[in-house]
């Protein structure tokens, strides 16, 4: 089920979505759409990036983070109750059925009459308990990748065995998006 995020009417909503580029500048296209992720692409696209830049956006929807480093979290400005619903972040890794799909749910609430004390932003790990985090070899080189529901330890082991096929090894090496397991 979708992870739920809340925002008050009139405030900005933050919907997180991340991936790890294989190397700085090695970006993959990303789309954000209103509604759950369809089989391919995004429905009702509100924002889209290509391999270089944000190439489509609509008013009130923008990327606040550094999308060149894989932070493609969506900010929705000045939300209304009508903004409630499911949003799709789709990381469009080239290849057949290769996309990473993340459905997140935005709940817009009416502001409380008494303004509460400011609270910390929701803990990311709690929000995405199934995120796969891998540590590289250098200090402070923790990478957070998009949720990969189709990969488990058994499959990683199986994939490692299949890497003996040199053609697959070469293709994976050159594919432009990597997962390092260290």
């Amino acid at each position: 089920s979708e992870v739920e995020y809340r925002a008050e009417v009139g405030q900005n909503a933050y919907l997180p979505c991340f991936y790890t580029p294989a190397a700085p500048g090695n970006l993959v296209p990303v789309c954000w759409g209103k509604g759950a992720c369809p089989v391919f692409e995004c429905g009702n696209v509100v924002l889209r990036t290509d391999e270089r830049d944000v190439n489509y956006w609509t008013s009130r929807y923008w990327l606040n983070g550094d999308f060149r480093k894989g932070d493609v979290s969506l900010t929705i400005e000045n939300v209304t109750l009508a903004d409630s619903g499911i949003y799709c972040c789709r990381i469009q890794i080239p290849g057949i059925m290769n996309d990473e799909k993340h459905n997140v749910k935005l709940v817009v609430i009416k502001p409380a009459k008494v303004t509460p004390a400011p609270t910390r932003q929701r803990d990311f790990t709690a929000a995405f308990p199934r995120m796969l985090t891998t540590r590289g070899h250098g200090p402070a080189e923790t990478q957070t990748l998009g949720s990969l529901p189709d990969i488990n330890l058994t499959q990683i082991s199986t994939l490692a065995n299949e890497l003996r096929d040199s053609r697959l090894a070469n293709d994976l090496r050159d594919s432009g998006a990597t997962i390092r397991i260290g």
Epitope: E51, M97, D150, Q155, T158, D171
Partner: antibody, heavy 118, light 113 residues
Framework: QVQLQQSGGGLVQPGGSLRLSCAAS????????MSWVRQAPGKGLEWVSG????????YNADSVKGRFTISRDNSKNTLFLQMNSLRAEDTAVYYC???????????WGQGTLVTVSS | EIVMTQSPDSLAVSLGERATINCKSS????????????LAWYQQKPGQPPKLLIY???TRESGVPNRFSGSGSGTDFTLTISSLQAEDVAVYYC?????????FGQGTKVEIK
């Protein structure tokens, strides 16, 4: 060597159902995404359905959405396509195909003819 | 989805002569991060399943004769048979695997003149 042996085609009336099977040998089915591709008589190739290595994600062409279901039994190294509510325009030779590294189709089954006619 | 268009629909070439098939995609299938074009070519003989000939635009599959070559980038691609042999009579398809559903060209039938 890699082999994909198909079965289950035949003649069916409109609205009927069929289940196609594709038995894989020579490789570990669970390590690869798989697809079904069809070819109407005298026509070109059309991708129909696909499934991830684990079976956790499935994909269907709009033309078969809600009617066809792709599945796999990795323990039996077999891929399936359940076809319901068949229409005349579904008449085609259906091929199962192995997807290499989420890129291209490197091995194909021999094909099985599905004819939808009253 | 990406639409693939081949030309010509058919061509007749004399034995030993060059055959050239063109394929155009409705949007680029070049991924700039790895400089690869996500395009493959298949050969289909009558009564047989398609056979992978070329992937990544120009890489021949194992066992494919070197008279088959692929070229192009972005949206325009070419399959060339440098010296047509009798066993090359077939329908040839291009296919993109860059994004969305994998899509094929409509096919080009190669015959002997």
């Amino acid at each position: 060597q890699v082999q994909l042996q198909q079965s289950g085609g035949g003649l069916v009336q409109p609205g009927g159902s069929l289940r196609l099977s594709c038995a894989a040998s020579g490789f570990t089915l669970s390590s690869y995404a798989m697809s079904w591709v069809r070819q109407a008589p005298g026509k070109g190739l059309e991708w129909v359905s696909g499934i991830s290595g684990s079976g956790g994600s499935t994909y269907n062409a709009d033309s078969v959405k809600g009617r066809f279901t792709i599945s796999r039994d990795n323990s039996k190294n077999t891929l399936f396509l359940q076809m319901n509510s068949l229409r005349a325009e579904d008449t085609a030779v259906y091929y199962c195909a192995k997807i290499f590294g989420s890129y291209y189709f490197d091995y194909w089954g021999q094909g099985t003819l599905v004819t939808v006619s009253s | 989805e990406i639409v693939m268009t081949q030309s010509p629909d058919s061509l007749a070439v004399s034995l030993g002569e060059r055959a050239t098939i063109n394929c155009k995609s409705s949007q680029s299938v070049l991924y700039s991060s790895n400089n690869k074009n996500y395009l493959a070519w298949y050969q289909q003989k009558p009564g047989q399943p398609p056979k992978l000939l070329i992937y990544w635009t120009s890489t021949r599959e194992s066992g494919v004769p070197n008279r088959f070559s692929g070229s192009g980038s972005g949206t325009d691609f070419t399959l060339t048979i440098s010296s047509l042999q009798a066993e090359d009579v077939a329908v040839y398809y291009c296919q993109q695997y860059y994004s969305g559903p994998p899509t094929f060209g409509q096919g080009t039938k190669v015959e002997i003149k």
